[in-house]
């Protein structure tokens, strides 16, 4: 798993991008939990990376994801989303030209080395939900969630808006 | 109606303590993340304090470190600034502020302004 | 600390001329940075955020640019409402935020 010091090297080179035409609004690095508190973390295994759901012994460090957040031009039908009423969409990036995908064929997520513009797989509306949690609906899928399937990110299907707070599609952002 | 409203500026003398309230109306407030910016007579703007949505992350500049405590109620949809060991070159007018998007983190611009409170500190 | 420096101090300019306003960063802020304009005895109005992005509302004849430590916004043709004080302000993962000094746009 990278640290957050490898992160902090390259992210000011990311802030220049413009992708698909548009530009972020706001960028930063965080970490991301479940809502039962397991860290995703992000491991080089023969030359690709692997996304896994774990709990972390005490005092290791948690890895950090850059979040970089972009406007849809898509009206929000969340209250308290933006004055203007867009949507918010992420991408979400653990380490240098590596951003994390959507994979619908497979529903599985994955981490792809990019080049820009990003592709349409790589952005995820973002719902704001309860507990201060937060859930990521792909771009090119609407009502398909990133969330977590036997300890990996998977993509999962969510059919009516009461599932929206099924817990294993719930994430926490976190500074620390 | 978008809004902000704050209220518990006044005149206290240097070394007490005042806290400021900020009443939010007509949006999410557990979504936004929350700032404290002031505003001496005749002088540009100051960044003061900033709170996450949650109220689980603070922020401060390092003039007020210490001394200023910044919290919110999510429940009562209000933001607070304690400010303790009050000093002259705290005399400003103090505006609380709302970011932008609802991304909860305070990484972000200020799109809601209070219309600000006075505070003076003077013996 | 980063230190928002904003030049020039003071701009005199007539209506319908162009206003370069310039904010540097002493270092880099990514794009988290925006402009407010204020008026005296008003709140701070956002024009400009994400460095480049112009809030609901404002006229197209404000726009902002630049990453990392220099910014620039643009007031394409003065208004007489345009004359006000402007502030640059950073909002990067390495608090405290700042603004910058300001720069005011006063009528020649």
């Known amino acids: 798993a990278f640290g957050i010091s490898g992160v902090q090297k390259y992210t000011r080179a990311l802030h220049d991008s413009s992708i698909t035409g548009i530009s972020p609004i706001t960028e930063y690095l965080a970490s991301l939990s479940t809502y039962n508190d397991q860290s995703i973390t992000f491991a080089l295994e023969d030359e690709s990376y692997e996304i896994y759901v774990e709990d972390l012994k005490k005092d290791e460090k948690k890895d950090k994801v850059l979040l970089s957040y972009y406007e849809s031009q898509h009206p929000s039908n969340e209250s308290g989303d933006g004055v203007d009423g867009k949507m918010l969409m992420v991408t979400l990036s653990p380490t240098k030209d590596f951003w994390l995908h959507a994979n619908n064929k497979e529903h599985s997520v994955e981490l792809h080395k990019c080049e820009k513009p990003l592709p349409d797989q790589a952005f995820f509306v973002l719902h704001n939900m309860h507990s201060n949690c937060v859930s990521f609906e792909c771009k090119t899928d609407p009502g398909v969630f990133i969330g977590v399937k036997d300890n990996h990110l998977a993509l999962i299907k969510v059919d009516s808006s009461e599932n929206l707070c099924t817990e294993n599609i719930l994430f926490k952002l976190s500074e620390t | 109606e978008v809004q902000l409203v704050e209220t518990g500026g006044g005149l206290i003398q240097p070394g007490g303590s005042l806290r400021l309230s900020c009443a939010a109306s007509g949006f999410t407030f557990s979504s936004y993340a929350m700032s404290w910016v002031r505003q001496a007579p005749g002088k540009g703007l100051e960044w003061v304090s900033a709170?996450?949505?949650?109220?689980?992350?603070?922020y401060y500049a390092d003039s007020v470190k210490g001394r200023f405590t910044i919290s919110r109620d999510n429940s009562k949809n209000t933001l607070y600034l304690q400010m303790n060991s009050l000093r002259a070159e705290d005399t400003a007018v103090y505006y609380c502020?709302?970011?932008?998007?609802?991304?909860?983190?305070?990484?972000?611009?200020?799109?809601?302004w209070g219309q600000g409170t006075l505070v003076t500190v003077s013996s | 600390e980063i230190v928002l420096t904003q030049s020039p101090g003071t701009l005199s300019l007539s209506p319908g001329e162009r206003a370069t306003l310039s904010c540097r960063a002493s270092q880099s802020v990514g794009i988290n940075l925006s402009w407010y304009q204020q008026k005296p005895g008003q709140a701070p109005r956002l024009l400009i955020y994400?460095?480049?992005h112009r809030a609901t509302g404002i006229p197209d004849r404000f726009s902002g640019s630049g990453s990392g430590t220099d910014f620039t916004l643009t007031i394409s043709r003065l208004e007489p409402e345009d004359f006000a004080v402007y502030y640059c302000h950073q909002y990067s993962q390495s608090p405290p935020f700042t603004f910058g000094g300001g720069t005011k746009v006063e009528i020649k």
């Open positions: 502020a709302r970011t932008l998007h609802g991304i909860r983190a305070a990484y972000d611009a200020f799109i809601i």
């Open positions: 994400g460095a480049s």
């Open positions: 709170i996450s949505g949650s109220g689980g992350s603070t």
